[in-house]
Amino acid sequence: GILNLNKMVKQVTGKMPILSYWPYGCHCGLGGRGQPKDATDWCCQTHDCCYDHLKTQGCSIYKDYYRYNFSQGNIHCSDKGSWCEQQLCACDKEVAFCLKRNLDTYQKRLRFYWRPHCRGQTPGC
């Protein structure tokens, strides 16, 4: 769920998600439209696709709570719980490390980006 994702992103990137990523660009945070603005924004667009796939599979992406371990900079998704919980953790782990990989191109100007400026074709999943 959202609490899992926030905690994981903070642990992996060292940034407070509420201040740094939700929202950011055209796809980080709730919703998403248009062409991603940079690599960080692409991480979020890919994550949206991951969630969309789980939604089509009947998973409660915002409610399901999963267990994971954070140790020595790595995330280990617990193999306990339901199929949805395990898949949700995998989606969140991927976006957390994607955001970390792209910290060097993070642009402060894209925080709280005005969504009406998000134009162009929204990438498909």
Partner: antibody, heavy 120, light 106 residues
Framework: QVTLKESGPGILQSSQTLSLTCSLS??????????VSWIRQPSGKGLEWLAH???????RYNPSLKSRLTISKDTSRNQVFLKITSVDTADTATYYC????????????WGQGATLTVSS | QIVLTQSPAIMSASPGEKVTISCSAS?????MYWYQQKPGSSPKPWIF???NLASGVPARFSGSGSGTSYSLTISSMEAEDAATYYC?????????FGSGTKLEIK
């Protein structure tokens, strides 16, 4: 050879507490990924999952019964326990323990069941 | 929680007849699992991950489906197949079972 064997009181009065034991052999509950569930079946009816305990003592409960259930284990004796408080006639059923490995999403080995009758 | 509805509740089939048991989920699931239970015995895993037969299950059994609709099929009914069959999901928590289909031999 993997086996699970349930034991319990057989008969209880309404409002008493049910204590069940599942004795395991052929595998160790301390092995990473192992877990045991309790599942019950009223006579002639379907199956209802109650609770699950993992190798690391993490526990899960059926939300509809959570307030009445306690699952626990004794790794040294390779046993799993279930307590159900304030039983009534609706709890009359056969109680099974079953193994689930975390990477799988089904129960691969089941005990033969322990029958409970609750009298009012 | 996900509710699994099995149909029919009871059915009878003649030896050699094709049998199909259905399991409908209240919301989409990734896989379905099936158990066979005979009177006085505990359930036995029968089909896992929708279509994979458990060890020792005869090849006349098969499983299929996706989303909210799954089925177990016996290509040619035999006397030893008379039993109650349950579907089960652990797609989302808590794991749930269908109400069962009692299959009798004519």
């Amino acid at each position: 050879q993997v086996t699970l064997k349930e034991s319990g009181p057989g008969i209880l009065q309404s409002s008493q507490t049910l204590s069940l034991t599942c004795s395991l052999s052929g595998f160790s509950l301390s092995t990473s990924g192992m877990g045991v569930s309790w599942i019950r079946q009223p006579s002639g009816k379907g199956l209802e999952w109650l609770a699950h305990i993992y190798w690391d003592d993490d526990k899960r409960y059926n939300p509809s019964l959570k307030s009445r259930l306690t699952i626990s284990k004794d790794t040294s004796r390779n046993q799993v326990f279930l307590k159900i408080t304030s039983v009534d006639t609706a709890d009359t059923a056969t109680y099974y323990c079953a193994r689930r490995e975390s990477r799988y999403f089904y129960f691969d080995y089941w005990g033969q069941g322990a029958t409970l009758t609750v009298s009012s | 929680q996900i509710v699994l509805t099995q149909s029919p509740a009871i059915m009878s089939a003649s030896p050699g007849e094709k049998v199909t048991i259905s399991c409908s989920a209240s919301s989409s699931v990734s896989y379905m699992y099936w158990y066979q239970q005979k009177p006085g015995s505990s359930p036995k895993p029968w089909i896992f991950r929708t279509s994979n037969l458990a060890s020792g299950v005869p090849a006349r059994f098969s499983g299929s489906g996706s989303g909210t609709s799954y089925s177990l099929t016996i290509s040619s009914m035999e006397a030893e197949d008379a039993a109650t069959y349950y579907c089960q999901q652990y797609h989302s928590y808590p794991p749930t079972f269908g109400s069962g289909t009692k299959l009798e031999i004519k």
